[in-house]
Interface confidence: low
């Protein structure tokens, strides 16, 4: 299709070499058409304009993304050619930074239902540069933590070296939705709730004598709780004896709850005590079975191919540890009568 009629937008992504930073492009179709596609600015029935050129379906993924090769070759479908670029609804996610992401990206509705739709497209010219020493070396992180229940702020990485006074107007998005009230280089959060977690995008406009472009940065914000003051507790096994059948296989599960820690280094292991000897057992890897903001439940199993008479004289001990301390739970096997 002819892209000469597409509206054009220039964007700059200055990525930090420090973090595995992401980037996004929104399919900013001209108003009011985009309301039919991306739902970012839904119109109520009373607001529907007199004529709607686009009568596309309300399917959120109803746009198509292409990249325009620099050598003039035909447009390429993003999904087929670029595994590190993911289309999510009307947003294009770049999973890895790099100057090779520079180029022209075009989006348009998948369904062309009227002659007006042909010119309905946006061409985004993306320039990608690594952050240089000349640019702000200690900019805000692209990963930011907010402590639940406290106050906090989310800083725009590309502007965090500038004072609030000299900062240009900033447009913020959270999970692809415009935050219309936020205009400064940081969002102040009076009280942090878990819904403040998400992907934030900050945009501001820069210009020279020739043209203007949008500088964009993406911030992953996670809401966290304070580091636990407690050692982990063992949820299972609860009993210190377990009835078993000799000669049969046996799996004993150890489940432990670990409180949140900033640097999380949980230990969960099994060892066997036999009179004065004790040794650690090689068992399958631990796995996380439940993870919440406050804690994580981790499970690790010990597997006996068949229970022997000798096993009845041993104690099987689950040992769990975090930075605060450790907890153990021992199990003695008892033959089923």
């Amino acid at each position: 299709f002819n892209i000469s009629g597409c509206s054009t937008k220039k964007l700059l992504w200055t990525y930090s070499t420090r973090s595995e930073e992401e980037f996004v492009l929104f399919c900013d179709l001209p108003e009011p058409q985009k309301s039919h596609f991306c739902h970012r600015n839904r119109l109520s029935p009373k607001q529907v304009p007199e004529h709607l050129p686009f009568m596309g379906s309300n399917d959120l993924s109803d746009v198509q993304w292409y990249q325009q090769p620099s050598n003039g070759d035909p447009l390429e479908d993003i999904r087929k050619s670029y595994p590190h670029i993911i289309q999510d609804k009307c947003t294009l996610h770049f999973l890895t930074p790099g100057v090779n992401n520079s180029g022209s990206y075009i989006c348009r509705p998948k369904m062309i239902k009227s002659p007006y739709d042909v010119a309905c497209c946006v061409k985004m010219i993306l320039e990608v540069k690594p952050q240089t020493n000349a640019s702000c070396e200690y900019s805000a992180s692209h990963k930011q933590d907010l402590l639940l229940g406290s106050t906090g702020s989310i800083s725009c990485p590309s502007l965090s070296c500038q004072s609030d006074a000299q900062s240009p107007a900033v447009t913020w998005y959270k999970n692809g939705k415009l935050l219309s009230v936020e205009r400064s280089n940081r969002i102040v959060v009076d009280e942090v709730y878990d819904y403040h977690q998400g992907t934030y995008v900050c945009d501001y406009t820069q210009s020279d004598t020739v043209s203007s472009w949008t500088v964009r940065a993406v911030v992953q914000v996670r809401t966290i709780v304070g580091d636990t003051k407690l050692k982990p507790d063992i949820l299972d096994p609860v009993e210190d004896t377990l009835e078993v059948e000799l000669g049969k296989p046996l799996t004993i599960s150890c489940k432990a709850r670990f409180g949140f820690e900033r640097v999380f280094n949980p230990v969960i292991k099994w060892y066997i005590k036999d009179s004065d000897l004790e040794w650690e057992v090689s068992v399958p890897e631990a796995k996380s079975i439940k993870s919440t903001l406050k804690d994580e439940i981790i499970e690790r199993n010990i597997i006996l191919e068949k229970v022997t008479q000798r096993d009845l004289r041993r104690k099987f001990v689950c040992f769990v540890q975090n930075s605060i301390g450790n907890t153990t739970q021992s199990v003695q096997l008892k033959e089923k009568r």
Epitope: L147, S153, Q220, V263, N265, S323
Partner: antibody, heavy 124, light 107 residues
């Protein structure tokens, strides 16, 4: 750009409390963890502890009974108090910012911005 | 606490030399290791994090490798400004610990 500046008395008497403040300029104290590290003369670095802007702390067990780190977000400052000092506490004390980085699918922290350090001597 | 042992404790080298410093952890720390450079009277400066990732603005002659318990910092071609003390640091578990340092002197 973010800069850190330690301040406090350079001389403290044995058994007294060492008090230092770190002022953060060029950026907000919010969203980050902030650490204190010390370096005795001619020796290596020792991590003392960190504080999150909300007040959550974690201390080195070797100093835990004597250390208190606090934060004042309104002044963009965080402070260190070390009680019952001895000559062994003579050192250059540094404050630093801990920045979260995404690393091989984990979330780690490194000290990317440091103050220039302040020398504290414990002597009568 | 996890102990980090650096070797050598000191070494002499000339401009243009290739230099390797090692850091051994007393237990496995995955890739949660950083390297810092410290010059006399100055604060440490972050060079490498996550064992092998180069900090922004650090010359590419510095590189790091390793995971688990054994790590190395390599300077491919020493420059006059590289003569300093180098520290490794683990941030895999509390307390955060540093190696004892390696002093790099001009031969």
């Amino acid at each position: 750009q973010v800069q850190l500046q330690e301040s406090g008395p350079g001389l403290v008497k044995p058994s007294e409390t060492l008090s230092l403040t770190c002022t953060v300029s060029g950026g907000s104290i919010n969203n980050y963890y902030w650490s204190w590290i010390r370096q005795p003369p001619g020796k290596g670095l020792e991590w003392i502890g960190y504080i999150f802007y909300s007040g959550t702390t974690n201390y080195n067990p070797s100093l835990k009974s004597r250390v208190t780190i606090s934060v004042d977000t309104s002044k963009n400052q965080f402070s260190l108090k070390l009680s019952s000092v001895t000559a062994a506490d003579t050192a250059v004390y540094y404050c630093a910012r801990d920045v979260g980085i995404a690393a091989r699918n984990s979330y780690y922290y490194v000290m990317d911005v440091w103050g220039q350090g302040t020398t504290v001597t414990v002597s009568s | 606490a996890i102990q980090l042992t650096q070797s050598p404790s000191s070494l002499s080298a000339s401009v243009g030399d290739r230099v390797t410093i090692t850091c051994r952890a007393s237990q496995g720390i995955s890739s949660a290791l950083a390297w810092y450079q410290q010059k006399p009277g100055k604060a440490p400066k972050l060079l490498i994090y996550d064992a092998s990732s180069l900090e922004s603005g650090v010359p590419s002659r510095f590189s790091g490798s390793g995971s688990g318990t054994d790590f190395t910092l390599t300077i491919s071609s020493l420059q006059p400004e590289d003569f300093a003390t180098y520290y490794c640091q683990q941030f895999n578990s509390y307390p955060i610990t540093f190696g004892q340092g390696t002093r790099l002197e001009i031969k």
